[in-house]
C-alpha cells in the first residue's frame, strides 16, 4: 500500500499533499517542494524532505568530529536537488552558481566551488554514530535493555532491520548508536540508515515526520529516556576531500 | 502478562479460505509486529510472514504470496492471518509469534490453531 | 533463501548427561557482531518457546543449563545436564533475511 487509504493521509510523512487520484482511485502522495510521488509504507528520503522542509527556518548545527574522516552537517538547511529516486544528486549548487558535492545523506564532502566542480558519483554514508546525552535519571539504565529498547524502535519505527544497528553503547549519560549498512547489504526494500537517523533525530528534536502521530516516547522498563542533545557523525566509504586550510 | 490468544480450530474445503485471528495483551500493541509460522502435521516450522502493528502493512514469504494477507485492527489489539485457495498441504497448525525487542527473535507464541483443509 | 542444517535428527539422552545440537546455515547471519540466530523448544503438544536469542543470550526464565555458541555459519546448542522436562524438538532459526528460515529441527528424548 502506499497510503492510508480510509483518509488518504501519508503516514510516514506529513509534508505530503494526498489524493485519491491513484490507480484505481487509490490514495496517492506527493512531497511538499518536489511534487514526488512518495510511497508510504515507508521512510521518504532525505532529499525529499530536506526540499519539503525549505519554509522552516534555517537550523544550522556545528558538531564534534570524532575522527578526521567523520562529516557533520555544519551547513544546515538548503534546498537540494535530487534525483528521479529522491536521492541526493552528487553535486549541489546554490542560486549563486557555489557548487559542492555531497554524500548520500545530502552533508558536504569537499570544499564549495563554482559550476566547474565535477562530483563523479554520489558516495555512501556507511556508517553513522548518533551521540546521545540523556538527562538525568535516578539510576543508570541497564544497557542490555537500552539496546534492545532502541533496537526495537529502529526496527517498529523506522523499519530498520536490527541488522543495520551495528552497536549500542552506552556510558551514562552518552548514548551511542552505530548505524552501518554497505552498499553489498542493502537489499531492494531496505531503508537507508541515512533515512532512519534523519526521522530519528527529527523526533527526537520534538519535530516528528510523522502524521497524526505522537511525538517520541522513549521508555527503557518504564523509565522515561529524554534527550538533551544530539550529535550526529557520517562516515562514507571513500573519504571526503577537504583543502588542507579547512583543516586547521 | 504478555498473551497472544488464537482463535479455535477450523475445516475447510479445498479452493475455500481460512482467516485466523491472534488477540493480543500485556503489551502495548502498536509497539511489536507480528508473525505467522505454520508447522504442518509432524514437520517443522515454516514463516509465513510478518506485519507491522505500527503501520498495519505486511511482508510475506515469497511462496505465499497472493494466497495470504496479514491484517490488524488496533482498536482490538487482533492480527488476522487469512489464506485463500486452500489446499490439502495447507492443513497446518498456525501460530502467531510476537517479535522479540532487539534481534528479530518471536519471544511470545500463541497456542497455535489447527487447520484442516478436506473434501 | 537461507537453508539451515540442524544435525543429529534425533538425539536419545540420559538424564544428568549433558547434549550437543548442531545448527549449519548457508550464508552467514553475522552483521556487525550480531548473529542473527535463535534456539527455540517445541516441548510435545506446545507451541515453540524461545531458548536463546542473538546465538548465545539466554532468554528470560530459560533455565541456565542452556547455553548457544556460534558465529557465521556454524551455531551450537548445548544443555549441560538433561532433565526430563528438556524433551521435544529443538530448533534453530536465522532472522538475518526474509524469508526467515528454521532448520529441520531435532528431537530430544529420553533414553
Known amino acids: 500500500h502506499t497510503a492510508a487509504q480510509d483518509n488518504c493521509t501519508c503516514p510516514t510523512n506529513k509534508m505530503t499533499v494526498c489524493s485519491p487520484d491513484g490507480p484505481g482511485g487509490r490514495c496517492q502522495c506527493r512531497a511538499l517542494g518536489s511534487g514526488m510521488a512518495v510511497d508510504c509504507s515507508t521512510l521518504t528520503s532525505k532529499c525529499l524532505l530536506l526540499k519539503a522542509r525549505m519554509s522552516a527556518p534555517k537550523n544550522a548545527r556545528t558538531l564534534v568530529r570524532p575522527s578526521e574522516h567523520a562529516l557533520v552537517d555544519n551547513d544546515g538547511l538548503y534546498d537540494p536537488d535530487c534525483d528521479p529516486e529522491g536521492r541526493f544528486k552528487a553535486r549541489q549548487c546554490n542560486q549563486t552558481s557555489v557548487c559542492w558535492c555531497v554524500n548520500s545523506v545530502g552533508v558536504r564532502r569537499t570544499d564549495k566551488g563554482d559550476l566547474s566542480l565535477r562530483c563523479d558519483e554520489l558516495v555512501r554514508t556507511h556508517h553513522i554514530l548518533i551521540d546521545l546525552r540523556h538527562r538525568p535519571t535516578a539510576g543508570a539504565f541497564n544497557h542490555s535493555d537500552l539496546d534492545a529498547e532502541l533496537r526495537r524502535l529502529f526496527r517498529e519505527r523506522y523499519r530498520l532491520h536490527p541488522k543495520f544497528v551495528a552497536a549500542v553503547h552506552y556510558e551514562q549519560p552518552t548514548i551511542q548508536i552505530e548505524l552501518r549498512q554497505n552498499t553489498s547489504q542493502k537489499a531492494a526494500g531496505d531503508v537507508d540508515i541515512g533515512d532512519a537517523a534523519y526521522y530519528f533525530e527529527r523526533d527526537i528534536k520534538g519535530e516528528s515526520l510523522f502524521q497524526g502521530r505522537g511525538g517520541l516516547d522513549l521508555r527503557v522498563r518504564g523509565e522515561p529516556l529524554q534527550v538533551e542533545r544530539t550529535l550526529i557523525y557520517y562516515l562514507d566509504e571513500i573519504p571526503p576531500k577537504f583543502s588542507m586550510k579547512r583543516l586547521t | 502478562q504478555v498473551q497472544l490468544v488464537q482463535s479455535g480450530a477450523e475445516v475447510k474445503k479445498p479452493g475455500a479460505s481460512v482467516k485466523v485471528s491472534c488477540k493480543a495483551s500485556?503489551?502495548?500493541?502498536?509497539?511489536?509486529?507480528i508473525n505467522w509460522v505454520r508447522q504442518a502435521p509432524g514437520q517443522g516450522l515454516e514463516w509465513m510472514g510478518v506485519?507491522?502493528?505500527?503501520?498495519?502493512?505486511?511482508s510475506y514469504n515469497q511462496k505465499f504470496k497472493g494466497r495470504v494477507t496479514m491484517t490488524r485492527d488496533t482498536s482490538t489489539s487482533t492480527v488476522y492471518m487469512e489464506l485463500s485457495s486452500l489446499r490439502s498441504e495447507d492443513t497446518a497448525v498456525y501460530y502467531c509469534a510476537r517479535y522479540g525487542d532487539g534481534y528479530n527473535q518471536f519471544d511470545y507464541w500463541g497456542q497455535g490453531t489447527l487447520v484442516t483443509v478436506s473434501s | 533463501d537461507i537453508v539451515m542444517t540442524q544435525s543429529p535428527l534425533s538425539l536419545p539422552v540420559t538424564p544428568g548427561e549433558p547434549a550437543s545440537i548442531s545448527c549449519r546455515v548457508s550464508e552467514s547471519v553475522d552483521s556487525y557482531g550480531n548473529n542473527f540466530m535463535h534456539w527455540y523448544l517445541q516441548k510435545p503438544g506446545q507451541s515453540p518457546q524461545l531458548l536463546i536469542y542473538r546465538a548465545s543470550n539466554l532468554e528470560s526464565g530459560v533455565p541456565d543449563r542452556f547455553s548457544g555458541s556460534g558465529s557465521g555459519t556454524d551455531f551450537t546448542l548445548k544443555i549441560s545436564r538433561v532433565e526430563a522436562e528438556d524433551v521435544g524438538v529443538y530448533y534453530c532459526?536465522?532472522?538475518?533475511?526474509?524469508?526467515?528460515?528454521f532448520g529441520g529441527g531435532t528431537k530430544v528424548e529420553i533414553k
Open positions: 500485556g503489551y502495548t500493541f502498536t509497539d511489536y509486529s
Open positions: 532459526q536465522q532472522s538475518y533475511e526474509d524469508p526467515y528460515t
Open positions: 506485519i507491522s502493528t505500527y503501520y498495519g502493512d505486511a
